[in-house]
């Protein structure tokens, strides 16, 4: 648990910018959490350099990360889920740089899965359904999730629609007829919790029907 | 303000348990860990453990693990500490004090319960 | 887990003077906070994370350090400053040192 490198310490490598950034997935293994971390510049030479997080932890006073590849791990029940903990990108023991995290603040919810789209041809509209772990999960329950659609052919035009639940109804008449559609999800915690997006569920591709015209109505 | 206030005084024979309450107001009770702090007579102090209100997680000084039980009631904002197996040098003041958690100091003090403990 | 010892443990001072308090761990510590305690009460917070002052506690008092060695400054000291003082380390298992009394010469 030591402190900041003192001046004159570790010259060289304090020329780097070893600014990171984390994020928390809370019960993301059954009653374990996870914490990522990993440097915002992806040309930081990562060897020899550790991470550690002290404070707000269960009974220890530290726990070290693992490191996969370029990105630093630590799976564990040991997070307390109240106030901040200090994060430190060490070497050799010592500290290059720290910050006070509190990691209800950086929860990135698992991505949504089980996307599907069924056409009611009655209705004429799309139900649009998707699935989410957290709604099983004890602490990251409540979520605002962004479902996103666009015409295959507009690659940059996408359309939004926030929601609370898991499906969500799309009007016929507000698509174009006869057209591939892609679709995909993804969740954000809505209460207590902060933090980010999850990651984009895979996408689900439809295709709109031909616009049937009425009995007696005419062609323009 | 905020404030923390705690149980009564308590006499106990060895053996036996005591449960001590501290109700918190004036703030957000599961915003804030609650700590357990003890006074022998004459001593210093001796942090014993913590709860998150907000989870019921605990954290327990491992001197004391498998004697002490902090449970909370959320709905009436009140923290308590069961001391079991009592001995004669458990004889102190037993403290509950709000955990400022972004910085993890005690800002905010119950007024102390005297735990007795004589045969 | 971490030893935190006060020194001295009592320290006879008279009104005005100037009070330096040290706290000093078995291994190094990021934050360190001071309480004062007196006779019949709870402890109140001083300061905290190292330097800064708790709500409410006068401008007279004043912490430094890093590592291992840390200090509680009290640069004149106020009839109502005779107490006992106590460090507190910032991590699990939240020790506390001994204590300083201070007291009236």
């Known amino acids: 648990e030591s402190g900041y490198a003192q001046n004159g310490d570790l010259e060289d490598a304090e020329l780097d910018d070893y600014s990171f950034s984390c994020y928390s997935q809370l019960e993301v293994n059954g009653s374990q959490h996870s914490l990522t971390c990993a440097f915002e510049d992806p040309d930081v030479n990562t060897t020899n350099l550790e991470f550690e997080i002290c404070g707000a932890l269960v009974e220890v006073k530290c726990l070290s990360f693992r490191k996969l590849q370029e990105i630093y791990f630590i799976e564990t029940k040991k997070f307390l889920l109240i106030g901040k903990s200090n994060i430190c990108v060490k070497v050799g023991g010592k500290s290059l740089t720290c910050k006070k995290i509190d990691l209800t603040t950086i929860v990135k919810p698992e991505a949504p899965f089980d996307l599907s789209v069924i056409y009611r041809e009655g209705a004429n509209d799309f139900v649009v359904t998707f699935n989410t772990s957290h709604l099983q999960k004890k602490y990251v329950k409540v979520l605002m999730h962004d479902v996103a659609y666009r015409q295959e052919k507009d690659e940059n035009k996408w359309m939004h629609v926030n929601l609370s639940s898991t499906k969500l109804t799309l009007l016929q008449r507000n698509l174009q007829p006869e057209a591939m559609y892609e679709i995909k999800v993804r969740s954000i915690p809505d209460h207590y919790f902060k933090g980010f997006w999850s990651e984009w569920s895979p996408s689900y591709y439809f295709r709109t029907p031909e616009i049937n015209n009425s009995p007696g109505e005419m062609d323009p | 303000q905020v404030q923390l206030v705690q149980s009564g005084a308590e006499v106990k024979k060895p053996g036996a348990s005591v449960k001590v309450s501290c109700k918190a107001s004036?703030?957000?009770?599961?915003?804030?860990?609650m700590n357990w702090v003890r006074q022998a007579p004459g001593q210093g102090l001796e942090w014993m453990g913590l709860i998150n209100p907000y989870n019921g997680v605990t954290s327990y000084n491992q001197k004391f693990k498998g004697r002490v039980t902090l449970t909370r009631d959320t709905s009436i904002s009140t923290a308590y500490m069961e001391l079991s197996r009592l001995r004669s040098d458990d004889t102190a003041v037993y403290y509950c004090a709000r955990g400022d958690g972004n910085y993890w100091y005690f800002d905010v003090w119950g007024q102390g319960t005297t735990v007795t403990v004589s045969s | 887990e971490i030893v935190l010892t006060q020194s001295p443990a009592t320290l006879s001072l008279s009104p005005g003077e100037r009070a330096t308090l040290s706290c000093s761990a078995s291994s190094s510590v990021t934050y360190m906070h001071w309480y004062q305690q007196k006779p019949g009460q709870a402890p109140r917070p001083l300061i905290y994370?190292?330097?800064k002052l708790a709500s409410g506690i006068p401008a007279r008092f004043s912490g430094s350090g890093s590592g291992t060695d840390f200090t509680l400054t009290i640069s004149s000291l106020e009839p109502e400053d005779f107490a006992v003082y106590y460090c507190?380390?910032?991590?699990?298992?939240?020790?506390f040192g001994g204590g300083t009394k201070v007291e009236i010469k």
């Open positions: 004036g703030y957000t009770f599961t915003g804030y860990t």
């Open positions: 994370e190292i330097s």
């Open positions: 507190q380390e910032w991590n699990y298992p939240y020790t």
